[in-house]
């Protein structure tokens, strides 16, 4: 079954900074992935990026890079400014349309008190859904 | 095919507030980001802030930050935009625009909405 | 904050021609810069994209190029609709237009 996993994590350097680690598990190729906080793409969350692998990449405030790690992971970097909701306890969620599997999603989020630098444990899977 | 109506002119007066709207068609509003633009007569575009509406989550752009106030209404898939205190510095046309993501920003715009601000 | 400072602010060719606009930011903005034309009465149009990602419905004589800082925008064989104000649009992060181009015919 594939599986997508989601981490966060905040910027040691830079309190206010974070960054969003996701990864598909899975066979297939990967048509496009929607990054949302506040909840899933479609479900209540606000779309911060959507990566596709020819037409590009767009992200939108607060988030500043958003970027393919390999063919199947991406990573979005952050800045906690600006925006009517803080995100320093907002769960983050990555879909992945991929062919012929369909669309996974799974959210992660900062983990509690965490010191800067540590991220959120590798693979939460609070939501994972298939369309 | 995608469609941004605008609510019509507007003449106020110096001190209240209004609020304009912008209705959408043609596509799944809670999926696009709303955004607002101020043209001033003889002068450029400006952004003024952008509305998400699948989750109400706003941005502004310093400079209208407690001028303007987005919300939406995904019932009646409409946006609006609440301008406090006006003076004649607000007198000017407000267009929404969609921002079509990977197809583009600001892809659909509304047609304008005319303010005038004058005692 | 990006700035956008677009070049020249006004200019005039003739029909057949071809001009050029010119937008600089401040910063890296990779390659998110889009090119609208505006005209009075209506909303503006979107043309370009992503530096030179024309849209569906936008002719080939219309252009653009440029990465980094510097970006150009061309229109060539001018037709009398052409008449209109140009504006560039960083969209790298958040928002910033370009002050205009009025273009008109000779």
């Known amino acids: 079954t594939p599986e997508v996993w989601v981490q966060v994590q905040m910027e040691a350097t830079e309190l206010s900074s974070f960054t969003v680690h996701c990864g598909f598990l899975g066979p297939g190729s990967i048509s496009l992935v929607t990054v949302s906080w506040g909840g899933p793409d479609g479900a209540g969350g606000t779309k911060l990026a959507v990566l596709h692998p020819e037409l590009g990449t767009r992200q939108w405030a607060p988030a500043r890079q958003a970027r393919w790690e390999t063919q199947s992971s991406i990573s979005l970097a952050l800045e906690d400014s600006g925006a009517s909701s803080p995100f320093a306890n907002t769960t983050f969620c990555c879909k992945f349309a991929s062919f012929p599997e369909g669309s996974w999603e799974s959210c992660g989020s900062l983990p509690p008190s965490s010191d800067p630098g540590l991220s959120a444990p590798p693979t939460p899977v609070p939501i994972l859904r298939a369309d | 095919q995608v469609h941004l109506q605008q609510s019509g002119p507007d003449l106020v007066k110096p001190g209240v507030s209004v609020k304009i709207s912008c209705k959408a068609s043609?596509?799944?509003?809670?999926?696009?980001?709303i955004n607002w633009v101020k043209q001033r007569p003889g002068q450029g575009l400006e952004w003024i802030g952008w509305?998400?509406?699948?989750?109400?989550?706003?941005y502004y752009n310093e400079k209208f930050k407690g001028k303007a106030t987005l919300t939406v209404d995904k019932s009646s898939s409409t946006a609006y935009m609440l301008l406090s205190s006006l003076t004649s510095e607000d007198s000017a046309v407000y267009f929404c625009?969609?921002?079509?993501?990977?197809?583009?920003?600001?892809?659909?715009w509304g047609q304008g909405t005319t303010l005038t601000v004058s005692s | 904050d990006i700035q956008m400072t677009q070049s020249p602010s006004s200019l005039s060719a003739s029909l057949g021609g071809k001009v050029t606009i010119t937008c600089k930011a401040n910063?890296?903005?990779?390659?998110?810069i889009a090119w609208y034309q505006y005209k009075p009465g209506k909303g503006p149009r979107l043309l370009i994209h992503?530096?030179?990602t024309l849209q569906p419905d936008i002719p080939s004589r219309f252009s653009g190029s440029g990465s980094g800082r510097d970006f150009s925008f061309s229109i060539s064989n001018l037709e009398p609709e052409d008449i209109a104000t140009y504006y560039c649009?960083?969209?790298?992060?958040?928002?910033?237009f370009g002050g205009g181009t009025k273009l008109e015919i000779k």
């Open positions: 649009l960083q969209y790298d992060y958040l928002y910033t």
């Open positions: 992503y530096t030179s």
């Open positions: 910063q890296d903005i990779n390659k998110y």
């Open positions: 043609g596509y799944t509003f809670t999926d696009y980001y």
């Open positions: 509305i998400f509406p699948g989750s109400g989550t706003t």
């Open positions: 625009a969609r921002d079509g993501g990977l197809r583009g920003p600001f892809d659909y």
